[in-house]
Amino acid sequence: EDELQVIQPEKSVSVAAGESATLRCAMTSLIPVGPIMWFRGAGAGRELIYNQKEGHFPRVTTVSELTKRNNLDFSISISNITPADAGTYYCVKFRKGSPDDVEFKSGAGTELSVRAKPS
């Protein structure tokens, strides 16, 4: 069985302020089981953008139906983009662990740049 890969196909995405940004991410396998999370930035100071398991993320919607048992698409859309949203976004697969899930593999990242709103 091939080891799971996290694929973020776009290195960069540019969006006008006020629009929505779609950040694409796909897995090549569902194994090992565990949640997907999206972060802005890397390292200890990274910001959680979306957690498949829990939490309320009002500006984030998933592009595909994550409750499908065979879903491999973990792309997200972030609404009402502002310049403060600029940065590099990472799609990260965790494997289940106790008491805490363990980071298993990260995508290469997608850099989001924000253009000025057209006048």
Partner: antibody
């Protein structure tokens, strides 16, 4: 409070059909996958089928595949189980259950009894 | 198939462990369900291996390692008498499976 209420059970003859319903309240039904689980008299729990939140994806155990169909109507906050070609082995209490993000169960209904007898 | 003991017994205040084996740790999440009488609604006491619903007492805990999951009741009470079912969700097959159930008797 999350509430799941099954209905539609009853006594039917072998070969007949029955449609079970599960009315959901207290949560955003359209955001959750759902399942049907049954318990035959004197037996343990048996998962039958699960359906994704939007209703486009369904899975079944082999013993009911082709006979049972799980469906949902998110506008009515309702889950259904259409059961065809029933046999005595389908006699059981049927529960609907809400799925967690990883397809286990967190809330259950009280169940509805289906009896298949000639 | 998931395998669990048919029965366990304990005195009030003792610690009870119920094991459930047969799943692949890398592809399986486990849950535990309490049923106080046949045909009554099951109650979820643990899901996602070790997550306890907010309305379940803290004496219930769960863990998983290797090919087995364990439900632990620390300081068991008479009202914990029930049948406990383990269940697994397998991410390879997309199928849920239940164990045959363990009858807990509190002496």
């Amino acid at each position: 409070d999350v509430q799941l209420v099954e209905s539609g059970g009853g006594v039917v003859r072998p070969g007949e059909s029955l449609r079970l319903s599960c009315a959901a309240s207290g949560f955003t039904f359209s955001s959750y996958a759902m399942s049907w689980v049954r318990q035959a008299p004197g037996k343990g729990l048996e998962w039958l089928a699960g359906i994704s939140a939007g209703g486009s994806d369904a899975y079944y155990i082999d013993s009911v595949k082709g006979r049972f169909t799980i469906s949902r109507d998110n506008s009515k906050n309702s889950l259904y189980l259409q059961m065809n070609s029933l046999t005595a082995e389908d006699t059981a209490v049927y529960y609907c259950a809400r799925e967690t993000w990883n397809h286990l169960f967190d809330y259950w209904g009280l169940g509805t009894l289906v009896t298949v007898s000639s | 198939a998931l395998t669990q003991p048919a029965s366990v017994s304990a005195n009030p205040g003792e610690t009870v462990k119920i094991t459930c084996s047969g799943g692949d740790w890398y592809s399986t999440y486990y849950g535990w369900y309490q049923q106080k009488s046949p045909g009554s609604a099951p109650v979820t006491v643990i899901h996602s291996d070790d997550k306890r619903p907010s309305d379940i007492p803290s004496r219930f805990s769960g863990s998983a390692s290797g090919s087995a999951a364990t439900l632990t009741i620390t300081g068991v009470r008479v009202e914990d008498e029930a049948v406990y079912y383990c269940a697994g969700y397998d991410g390879r097959t997309y199928i849920n499976t239940f164990g045959a159930g363990t009858t807990l008797t509190v002496l």
